[in-house]
């Protein structure tokens, strides 16, 4: 992936739009489209006052770990959907899109250097609090977490990283 592709705001906006679309679709299904089990996802709540003050390395850790956990969660929901006859096939399309989107975003962030920043300097990783997580038991909640993660931590982090790269 070209190193700074994600710095074009339209790129991230496309994934955000897809996530919101999926969230809206699943809002309409019974019980929010139950997954039948609790899937661990990152807590997307952010204290923005604090976020602005804390180190870029710490942000990188949160974003990288969050992305990895979301990818795992989406893959798990993909497997659960494949084995379920209850859920409409159209949902599979949204989950597949999200899985593919998370792969692309991981590549784009790797190209931007988030992975390096997340592991060096070592103090950044060690000072970062363990990733806070919540449980998602419906597709609706999973897509809401996905959407909020992209609109929150990921957008904030890429904004910072892209500005740093401009200097």
């Amino acid at each position: 992936a070209p190193a700074r592709l994600i710095c074009d705001s339209r790129v991230l906006e496309r994934y955000i739009l897809e996530a919101k679309e999926a969230e809206n679709v699943t809002m309409g299904c019974a019980e929010g489209c139950s997954l039948g089990e609790n899937i661990t996802v990152p807590d997307t709540k952010v204290n923005f006052h604090h976020w602005k003050k804390s180190e870029a390395g710490r942000h990188a850790v949160e974003v990288w770990q969050g992305l990895a956990l979301l990818s795992e969660a989406m893959l798990r929901s993909q497997a659960l959907l494949a084995n379920s006859s209850q859920l409409p096939e159209t949902l599979q399309v949204h989950v597949d899109k999200a899985v593919s989107g998370l792969r692309s975003l991981t590549s784009l962030l790797r190209a931007l250097g988030v992975q390096k920043e997340a592991v060096s300097p070592p103090e950044a990783a060690s000072s970062a609090a363990p990733l806070r997580t919540v449980a998602a038991d419906t597709l609706c909640k999973l897509f809401r977490i996905y959407s909020n993660f992209l609109r929150g931590k990921l957008k904030l982090y890429t904004g910072e990283a892209c500005r740093r790269g401009d200097r």
């Epitope: 709540k45 952010v46 006052h49 602005k52 003050k53 809401r144 909020n148 609109r151 957008k155 904030l156």
Partner: antibody, heavy 116, light 109 residues
Framework: QVQLVQSGAEVKKPGASVKVSCKAS????????MSWVRQAPGQGLEWMGW????????NYAQKFQGRVTMTRDTSISTAYMELSRLRSEDTAVYYC?????????WGQGTLVTVSS | SYELTQPLSVSVALGQTARITCSGD??????VYWYQQKPGQAPVLVIY???KRPSGIPERFSGSNSGNTATLTISRAQAGDEADYYC???????????FGGGTKLTVLG
């Protein structure tokens, strides 16, 4: 002790500009973002924007974009908020507020009256 | 843009429990902050990160947040709690802070 001291009350004509200052003391000025919040008489709080005193970068509420400018002078630990093209609806108390884990320290407020 | 809605006023009898709500789309997914403002004074924070109290704020003040509603609860209300209360959160799409319209709390008796 930690405090923010703002400039005095101002009376302005519609169409004019006003520049309010906020002098910080008792802490490292460049270590905390500064926000500006206003409150019209008898109305609620309205966030206007923030400035990072270290780098000078800003983020303004959509409503004020194009009319507000936030600056700082690190040598005297002072933040400024300038609002241009004033109208009567801009009559309000303007507060600067330091951002810690939240808006933890507030200035005493500056009343800006816009009247012809 | 993101909007937070509060009731204009809430009344509570002295010593009873007051609940002030703050509604916003999926606000349960965000941190919420609550400020108390008395006439002629600057606001003072009473709750941050939805349910944390800064030092100096009595335990009578607590916060919760779920779905589309955040709530500030003031137990054993005192005359000194009479004030305007504002909730505050964040607009994810514009990266800006947002305040609710404010609620006037009246303590009766």
């Amino acid at each position: 002790q930690v405090q923010l001291v703002q400039s005095g009350a101002e009376v302005k004509k519609p169409g004019a500009s006003v520049k309010v200052s906020c002098k910080a003391s008792g802490y490292t000025f460049t270590s905390y973002y500064m926000s500006w919040v206003r409150q019209a008489p008898g109305q609620g709080l309205e966030w206007m924007g923030w400035i990072n005193p270290l780098k000078g970068n800003t983020n303004y509420a959509q409503k004020f974009q194009g009319r507000v400018t936030m600056t700082r002078d690190t040598s005297i630990s002072t933040a400024y908020m300038e609002l241009s093209r004033l109208r009567s609806e801009d009559t309000a108390v303007y507060y600067c507020a330091r951002e810690g884990m939240y808006f933890d320290i507030w200035g005493q407020g500056t009343l800006v009256t816009v009247s012809s | 843009s993101y909007e937070l809605t509060q009731p204009l006023s809430v009344s509570v009898a002295l010593g009873q429990t007051a609940r002030i709500t703050c509604s916003g789309d999926s606000i349960g997914d965000k941190y919420v902050y609550w400020y108390q403002q008395k006439p002629g004074q600057a606001p003072v924070l009473v709750i941050y990160d939805t349910n944390k109290r800064p030092s100096g704020i009595p335990e009578r003040f607590s916060g919760s947040n779920s779905g589309n509603t955040a709530t500030l609860t003031i137990s054993r209300a005192q005359a000194g709690d009479e004030a305007d209360y504002y909730c505050q959160s964040w607009d994810l799409d514009f990266n800006t802070y947002v305040f609710g319209g404010g609620t006037k709390l009246t303590v009766l008796g």
